[in-house]
């Protein structure tokens, strides 16, 4: 046993008392030692919330989390965890994930604001050559295994939770 020393440079039950920190929620990123929304603090020797540093230093392990946090602050946008990109809900209304439900449903109530292809869809026209056609198909299942970014890609329950977390 030792310690740090001279620097050359300047009433509950036993079960209730015991706190568990299960090692779950690990992402597939390079065998991380901390969950995705946390970073390793080498001085404290523990995982800390990325939220505390998003506005300050650049911490590469928090880059995706901080991007998703700032994206969520922007109205009408959501963060796609698979694409690791901030997506505008306006571009995918009609085939949108639940994160865009509020935005898109409000949009649909005022057709004047809709892009032409969606106005045609509402009036019964079919648009076969839309760039967004099928891009988010399967999302109406809300929590199905389908990936919002990659149709047909099967995800584990953990990955689904991650993709749909807001």
């Amino acid at each position: 046993m030792s310690g740090l020393g001279r620097s050359r440079r300047g009433g509950r039950s036993r079960v209730d008392q015991e706190e568990r920190f299960p090692q779950g929620l690990w992402t597939g990123v390079a065998m991380r030692s901390c969950p995705e929304e946390q970073y390793w603090d080498p001085l404290l020797g523990t995982c800390m919330s990325c939220k505390t540093i998003c506005n300050h230093q650049s911490q590469r392990t928090c880059a995706a989390f901080c991007r998703s946090l700032s994206c969520r602050k922007e109205q009408g946008k959501f963060y796609d965890h698979l694409l690791r990109d901030c997506i505008s809900c306006a571009s995918i209304c009609g085939q949108h994930p639940k994160q865009c439900a509020y935005f898109c449903e409000n949009k649909l109530r005022s057709p004047v604001n809709l892009p032409p292809e969606l106005r045609r869809q509402r009036s019964g026209e079919v648009e076969n050559n839309s760039d967004n056609s099928g891009r988010y198909q399967g999302l109406e299942h809300r929590g199905s295994e389908a990936s919002p970014a990659l149709p047909g890609l099967k995800l584990s329950a953990d990955q689904v939770a991650l993709v749909y977390s807001t």
Partner: antibody, heavy 117, light 111 residues
């Protein structure tokens, strides 16, 4: 005086589980993370993971995921590590250590775990 | 993971002489102006003891004959003058990235 007192040696059968303890004293328990390190006979040291009584942060070596679970009892300033599905590969001395300012400055005396039928 | 390579694997030095152990990291362990490299001494049947932390700072109760140097990826532990009690295994360990990793160890003996 800072002390980390570990539970005694364990002789267990393959496939069984074992829970070893590390009772701390002499400092404010919530101010430091407690880490666990494995040392197989005559070999180097391997970090298993840590547990922070303060913020619940639990850094963990993916190699030991599914093998080790760390828990803490704040009321007794004790940290536990449970090892499950034991095999001969898990026979080793396991140390707990207090982490501060980027280093493990105080260590427990070690707990020997022997897996044998 | 950051890999730490220690050299030599074993070392025999005469009493009163200088013992130098090296540790090379696979990537820099510098962190905001400090190097997160630590050195431990271990004697048979005992837990590791922190002798140097953050590359060049002495652990509590560690004699002044122990010193550490280096930054980035290359680090050294020096013991001078060597005493009988200094025999044992020495390990370097980095804290910068998780998982923290250890070197393979250097066995120090008296010649």
């Amino acid at each position: 005086e800072v002390q980390l007192q570990q539970s005694g040696p364990e002789l267990v059968k393959p496939g069984a589980s074992v829970k070893i303890s590390c009772k701390t004293s002499g400092y404010t328990f919530t101010e430091s993370t407690i880490h666990w390190v494995k040392q197989s006979h005559g070999k180097s040291l391997e970090w298993i993971g840590g547990i922070s009584p303060n913020n619940g942060g639990s850094p963990f070596n993916q190699k030991f995921k599914g093998k080790a679970t760390l828990t803490v009892d704040k009321s007794s300033s004790t940290v536990y590590m449970e090892l499950r599905s034991l095999s001969s590969e898990d026979s080793a001395v396991y140390y707990c250590a207090k982490w501060v300012r980027g280093a493990m400055d105080f260590w427990g005396q070690g707990t020997s775990v022997t897996v044998s039928s | 993971d950051i890999v730490l390579t220690q050299s030599p694997a074993s070392l025999a030095v005469s009493l009163g002489q200088r013992a130098t152990i090296s540790c090379r990291a696979s990537e820099s362990v510098d962190y905001y102006g400090m190097s997160l490299m630590n050195w431990f001494q271990q004697k048979p049947g005992q837990p590791p003891k922190l002798v140097i932390y953050a590359a060049s700072n002495q652990g509590s109760g560690v004699p002044a004959r122990f010193s550490g140097s280096g930054s980035g990826t290359d680090f050294r532990l020096n013991i001078h003058p060597l005493e009988e009690d200094d025999t044992g295994m020495y390990f370097c360990q980095q804290s910068k990235e998780a998982p923290p990793t250890f070197g393979g160890g250097t066995k120090l003996e008296i010649k």
